[in-house]
Interface confidence: low
């Protein structure tokens, strides 16, 4: 059976298409091509006489068509108006005519799309943004990409207008993009340049660094404040509620105890109109802000009950500190047998009893800091009881 095939079926505007013929009968006088689904003389494109190998253009000939001896028809520089059906009529030598109809579709070579936006400087958690992919073209699929990924499933993302419009509901700072739209048809695809959103947000609660609270007199105090914000926050500093300066960094050289107090960083975003503050307490003191971990030692860790005594010593290199002792989470001394000496650095137990067995540790502290030693275990043994009546125990 006579058939035709379009190569390709989907044609890019300006390209060419070949209407191939299959199963062409052997004995032919000629054949004609027509535009449409039926034979219509007014819409004949070309006729071909096999005997003379002569091609004759018809009323629907545009000058872009070429017919070949095998009946195939080449149409060059196609336009969208060429889309549709084409009918081949074969005039056989037995005067029985055969017909076959084929079709193809011409699509435009898509231009590079662009993204228009109703708001390129939205405010976080407040504004919605609608992106529209331009231009609007027929038979076109619209796709969107965020950060080079296809759209995630999100209730904040809505597609409309045949996917040509992407709406972001209640934008966040993470919605900066980039955003790209892609237009596709069966013959071409083109992606827009990326568009980024300048999401106005913040300021978030500022962070004051460094995190240190304690400083020694004579040191330099350098505090830096940062709050996530777009546009970047404007900063100001207050000390004990009194305005100092409008900078991101506060520097006070050679501090004294009088510089102790409440340091407030104020961050302001003039676009969002929002302000945030963070307060940091600074203490200027001679005392060591970090007391080193003390070491605990025992004269012996295994003793005989009611017989031995033991000395526990708490060692530290820090000055201006106090020492306290703990046994099983209880503060010591807890009995008359326990004595503290040498500024509480030594705990003496004399004599040791069964109930003194367990974990001991010491703690060194000053008004602003403290630290504990590792625990030490005291084991208390008793000599075996003498056997009574010559009987074996048990």
């Amino acid at each position: 059976q006579l058939t035709t095939e379009s190569m390709p079926f989907n044609v890019a505007e300006g390209k060419e298409v070949l209407l191939l013929v299959h199963n062409l009968p052997q004995q032919l006088f000629g054949y004609s091509w027509y535009k449409g689904e039926r034979v219509d003389g007014n819409r004949q494109i070309v006729g071909y006489a096999i005997g003379t190998q002569q091609a004759t253009p018809g009323p629907a000939n545009s000058g872009r068509e070429t017919i070949y001896p095998n009946a195939s028809l080449l149409i060059q520089n196609v336009t969208q108006n060429d889309t549709g059906f084409y009918t081949l009529q074969v005039i056989k030598s037995d005067l029985v005519n055969e017909e076959a109809t084929g079709q193809f579709h011409v699509y435009p070579e898509l231009p590079k799309p662009s993204i228009s936006s109703n708001n390129s400087n939205p405010v976080e958690d407040k504004d919605a943004v609608a992106f529209t992919c331009e231009p609007e073209t027929q038979d076109t699929t619209y796709l969107w990409w965020i950060n080079n990924q296809s759209l995630p499933v999100s209730p904040r993302l809505q597609l409309s207008n045949g996917n040509r419009t992407l709406t972001l509901l209640s934008v966040t700072r993470n919605d900066t993009g980039p955003y790209e739209c892609e237009i596709q048809n069966p013959v071409s695809a083109n992606r827009s340049d990326p568009v980024t959103l300048n999401v106005t947000y913040g300021p978030d609660t500022p962070t004051i660094s460094p995190s240190d609270t304690y400083y020694r007199p004579g040191a330099n105090l350098s505090l830096s404040c940062y709050a996530a914000s777009n546009p970047p926050a404007q900063y100001s500093w207050l000390i004990n509620g009194t305005f100092q300066q409008s900078t991101q960094e506060l520097f006070i050289p050679n501090i004294t105890v009088n510089n102790s107090g409440s340091y407030t960083c104020h961050a302001n975003n003039s676009v969002t109109g929002c302000n945030r503050t963070t307060v940091k307490t600074i203490i200027v003191t001679e005392l060591s802000p970090v007391v080193a971990k003390p070491q605990i030692k025992a004269s012996k860790t295994t003793v005989t009950g009611d017989k031995d005594s033991v000395n526990l010593t708490c060692s530290t290199n820090d000055t201006g500190i106090s020492i306290r002792w703990f046994f099983k989470n209880q503060s010591l001394p807890s009995s008359e047998r326990m004595k503290l000496s040498q500024g509480n650095t030594t705990l003496s137990i004399n004599p040791v009893k069964r109930e003194d067995a367990g974990t001991y540790w010491c703690e060194v502290f000053n008004p602003i800091s403290k630290n504990q030693s590792d625990p030490i275990m005291l084991n208390v043994n008793y000599n075996a009881l003498p056997q009574e009546n010559g009987l074996s125990p048990g």
Epitope: S209, S224, Y226, P231, P232, Q248, E249
Partner: antibody, heavy 121, light 111 residues
């Protein structure tokens, strides 16, 4: 199209003076902080000075403080650098550059083609 | 001696990925945005990256910036011969109250 065009460079003797200009076009000049950046022959970039969009805030590199003065005339869309007490180490190509962030996140998105200042006796 | 430290040179072959580092301190990179500039021979510098990692329009996505702590880096993927240039990092310095640049890295595209 944003354009920055420096002029006023040339040969000057040590101790002498020179005034550089930078004519801006293609953008609203008064909305942008502007800087001068220099580059000695065969060397890297060295920031010289910045002036805020309204001219109220000015900063200088330590190496030029007291000798170089930055200014701007927003009505003429022009940035200036008055250079006094010039030294041999001031020899460089001087670029004017635009900061689109008003100094909040300083960066230079457009640069002029530069003008050469040579300090030599 | 530059406030920001960059390697003086870097190299790679076409198609390779190269990274240029920029080291500073808490007064500049640690608390401020970093920018990267490309300077082709005989031309003015051109902005490649601003605000640590943002690309101006027109800059290929082969160029990317990142920052961690007091160090920043510029990565160039799919290296091309036209990438041969000097690359500078820059940031505002809170201590100096001024903008500081790295000493620059000369990138050579081999082969």
């Amino acid at each position: 199209e944003v354009q920055l065009l420096e002029s006023g460079g040339g040969l000057v003797q040590p101790g002498g003076s020179l005034r550089l200009s930078c004519a801006a076009s293609g953008f609203t000049f008064s909305n942008y902080a502007m800087s001068w950046v220099r580059q000695a022959p065969g060397k890297g970039l060295e920031w010289v000075s910045v002036i805020s969009h309204g001219g109220g805030s000015i900063y200088y590199a330590d190496s030029v403080k007291g000798r170089l003065t930055i200014s701007r005339d927003n009505s003429k869309n022009t940035l200036y650098l008055q250079m006094n007490s010039l030294r041999a180490e001031d020899t460089a190509v001087y670029y004017c550059a635009r900061d689109p962030t008003k100094g909040y996140a300083p960066t230079f998105d457009y640069w002029g083609q530069g003008t050469l200042v040579t300090v030599s006796s | 001696q530059s406030v920001l430290t960059q390697p003086p040179s870097a190299s790679g072959t076409p198609g390779q990925r190269v990274t240029i580092s920029c080291s500073g301190s808490s007064s500049n990179i640690g608390n401020n945005y970093v920018s990267w500039y490309q300077q082709l021979p005989g031309t003015a510098p051109k902005l490649l990256i601003y605000a640590d990692s943002k690309r101006p329009s027109g800059v290929p996505d082969r160029f990317s910036g990142s920052k961690s702590g007091t160090s920043a880096s510029l990565a160039i993927s799919g290296l091309r011969s036209e990438d041969e240039a000097d690359y500078y990092c820059g940031a505002w310095d809170l201590s100096l109250n001024g903008y500081v640049f790295g000493g620059g890295t000369k990138l050579t595209v081999l082969g």
